[in-house]
């Protein structure tokens, strides 16, 4: 959402979020690190191209032309400098002058040593319990953001991990149309469209950076869960990793796992949609998880096959009209899991990413809640690994990522909601090792061709 320094009456009224870096001569004297040439305060660039007609409520949602409903000036950083005040480096760079390349390795969770597994679990738990040092979340829409008295900004602190959950919730929430009116649900700024992969890529990158900074461990990396096993068991659902099944309630996590103590945020949908409030930092009930337990839907009781990944990587077009969840021959829609692994759209199909979520059969299978289950992180790092392999194979061909007429939030140059500072889909449509400072340690299955008899 927004830096704590910008959650003020003055910043919100002025529309300027350009915090100081080192204001030696007093407040406002080093906006965006301008005194050291790191950046400057400039007008926000927001995508104004048309979106598809399935969203008919222009002017009613704070997420439109993000982030202009809140701020119209932000820091534009020079060179490899980055961040809300140009005080950090772009992904893949480090050092005081952001001139040292860095490459971290994301590895299979199951391949980590016992120590590394334990370190990762403890780091996640620390992120759940550590207040985000930079960002605060809005608990009201823009028209109510200054509170009933017009002088009390409606923002809250939130933990690093819950911020990760909140940003996802905010991107998928319904459009509130007013008290007594039904909220509009045919909108999603991070799923069912071309931005699915780029949005989730930045989402992970932000969490990874936040955890690196929390630990002050620049080489910390998020591992992945290779969910394409074809099995009907969750191989990472053990107490030393993501938590086994509770013996007392098959939908809960074992009390021997730290994750059994986690409580979810953003679960009060009824309130958000009828009162127009936003999810806040209040924690609620436990994570629910019942892998392979949905007996009513046998198709989601088994994880994707290894060959499903090999097949989806042969779909050479990134996306295809209508750039939605019914696109056919679209790599994005295939890996997202609305098409079968060969790219053919079928409304009955749930494959790859979607199937992995639904297999978890609980918190992780509900879009507005899913990041509350930390398996979400591992599921999406694997999805991102598939995306990065596609980018490598097809030379990051962005030509079929639409500039306009995608679902709202999904145009190529749209600033991904609700990330700050503004970051476009294009910026994430690049090969990670060369451009974003991370790589995957992974072997891809080669497609097996069966000879017809």
């Amino acid at each position: 959402q927004f830096p704590r320094q910008c959650a003020t009456v003055e910043a919100l009224r002025s529309g300027m979020c350009c915090p100081d870096l080192s204001p030696v001569s007093g407040p406002g004297t080093d906006r965006c690190g301008s005194s050291s040439g790191r950046g400057r305060c400039e007008a926000v660039t927001a995508d104004s191209r048309p979106h598809s007609p399935q969203y008919p409520h222009d002017g009613r949602d704070d997420r439109e032309v993000w982030p202009l409903r809140f701020f119209n000036r932000t820091c534009h950083c020079n060179g490899n400098f980055s961040g809300h005040n140009c005080g950090t480096c772009r992904p893949g760079w480090r050092g005081a002058a952001c001139d040292q390349r860095v490459l971290i390795v994301r590895r299979n969770l199951l391949d980590l040593s016992k120590e590394e597994k334990n370190h990762f679990v403890r780091a996640l738990d620390m992120a759940k319990r550590t207040t985000h040092p930079l960002f605060v979340i809005a608990t009201r829409r823009s028209e109510e953001i200054l509170g009933p008295d017009g002088n009390t900004p409606q923002f809250e602190n939130i933990s690093i991990y819950n911020y990760f959950v909140w940003t996802h919730y905010y991107s998928v929430k319904k459009t509130f149309l007013g008290v007594g009116q039904e909220s509009f649900g045919e909108v999603d700024f991070s799923h069912e469209g071309p931005a699915f992969l780029t949005w989730h890529r930045y989402h992970l990158l932000r969490l990874e950076k936040d955890m690196q900074e929390m630990l002050q461990e620049p080489s910390f990396s998020l591992p992945y869960w290779n969910f394409a096993t074809g099995k009907n068991v969750c191989d990472i659902c053990t107490d030393d990793l993501m938590g086994s099944r509770s013996n007392f309630d098959s939908t809960l996590i074992s009390p021997n796992s730290v994750f059994s103590q986690w409580r979810v945020v953003c679960d009060s949908l009824e309130d958000y949609d009828t009162l127009g409030t936003l999810c806040n930092s209040t924690e609620d009930g436990p994570i629910r998880r019942n892998p392979a337990g949905n007996v009513a839907r046998p198709m989601v009781q088994r994880l994707p096959e290894p060959q499903d990944v090999a097949q989806c990587l042969e779909v050479g077009l990134f996306d295809t009209p209508p750039f939605y969840s019914n696109s056919t021959n679209s790599f994005r829609n295939t890996v997202e899991g609305y098409s079968d692994p060969t790219g053919k759209y079928d409304p009955a199909v749930r494959s790859l990413h979607n199937l992995a979520h639904l297999f978890l059969n609980g918190t992780g299978g509900q879009t507005h809640l899913s990041p509350n289950d930390p398996i979400f992180v591992l599921l999406h790092t694997f999805t991102d690994a598939v995306f990065d392999e596609w980018l490598r194979r097809y030379n990051a061909d962005i030509s079929t990522f639409p500039l306009e007429n995608a679902p709202i939030g999904h145009n190529r140059q749209y600033n991904m909601v609700p990330f700050w500072p503004p970051v476009t889909n294009t910026e994430m449509f690049v090969t990670a090792p060369d451009n974003l400072g991370y790589t995957y340690e992974i072997q891809w299955p080669s497609r097996e061709f069966s000879v017809p008899e």
Epitope: G95, S113, N118, E213, L215, Q216, E217, P218, S219, F220
Partner: antibody
């Protein structure tokens, strides 16, 4: 280039306190955690823990809780180690080392500060 | 907690000879092992990281090998300035560092 300059040797009586400093230069102090390592005379190296120089949050190794305090002053890019209720067995060289290039090893070290506790 | 055991405790060799120092971990540390050299009155100096990578400015006569639980530091041809104490190190849980007890390399 990265440099860590520690304060000079200290001679203290049992029960007293000591505060040693480690001034960093050549990098952004608040970007990298600072570790503290102890080496008793003729002995090996022992990790005492580290301080997050961004948040000030310290993490202590087993055996280094209670009398040992890590702190810092970001305005002068300096980390501090304070030891209270000194005992003879605290006699050692204390090193600071930032977690700079990687979290897996320590590639820059201060020159060390000898603390001698003797009556 | 992982324990690192170095052997031998003392190694007596002459300049020009080959030195082989061993470090054994009580359980696998993958390839996350480093070697340091410490001379009297000086701070430790990083020689090798990730089991086999030479740190900046370290001469080619120093090499590291091994993975899992068994690691070796080799000095192909000893120079007079190489006589010192050598420590192996791994990063234990929660960003703490564990060191071996050291091997003293002395002139024969």
């Amino acid at each position: 280039q990265v440099q860590l300059v520690q304060s000079g040797s200290e001679l203290k009586k049992p029960g007293a306190s000591v505060k040693i400093s480690c001034k960093a230069s050549g990098y952004t102090f608040t970007s990298y955690a600072m570790n503290w390592v102890r080496q008793a005379p003729g002995q090996g190296l022992e990790c005492m823990g580290w301080i997050n120089t961004n948040t000030g949050n310290p993490t202590y190794a087993q055996g280094f809780t209670g009398r040992f305090v890590f702190s810092m002053d970001t305005s002068v890019s300096t980390a501090y180690l304070q030891i209270s209720s000194l005992k003879a067995e605290d006699t050692a060289i204390y090193y600071c080392a930032p977690r700079y290039s990687s979290s897996w090893y320590l590639d820059y070290w201060g020159q060390g500060t000898l603390v001698t506790v003797s009556s | 907690e992982i324990v690192l055991t170095q052997s031998p405790a003392t190694l007596s060799l002459s300049p020009g000879e080959r030195a082989t120092l061993s470090c054994r971990a009580s359980q696998s540390v993958s390839s996350y092992l480093a070697w340091y050299q410490q001379k009297p009155g000086q701070a430790p100096r990083l020689l090798i990281y990730d089991a086999s990578n030479r740190a900046t400015g370290i001469p080619a006569r120093f090499s590291g090998s091994g993975s899992g639980t068994d690691f070796t530091l080799t000095i192909s041809s000893l120079e007079p300035e190489d006589f010192a104490v050598y420590y192996c190190q791994q990063r234990s849980n929660w960003l703490m560092y564990t060191f071996g007890q050291g091997t003293k390399l002395e002139i024969k």
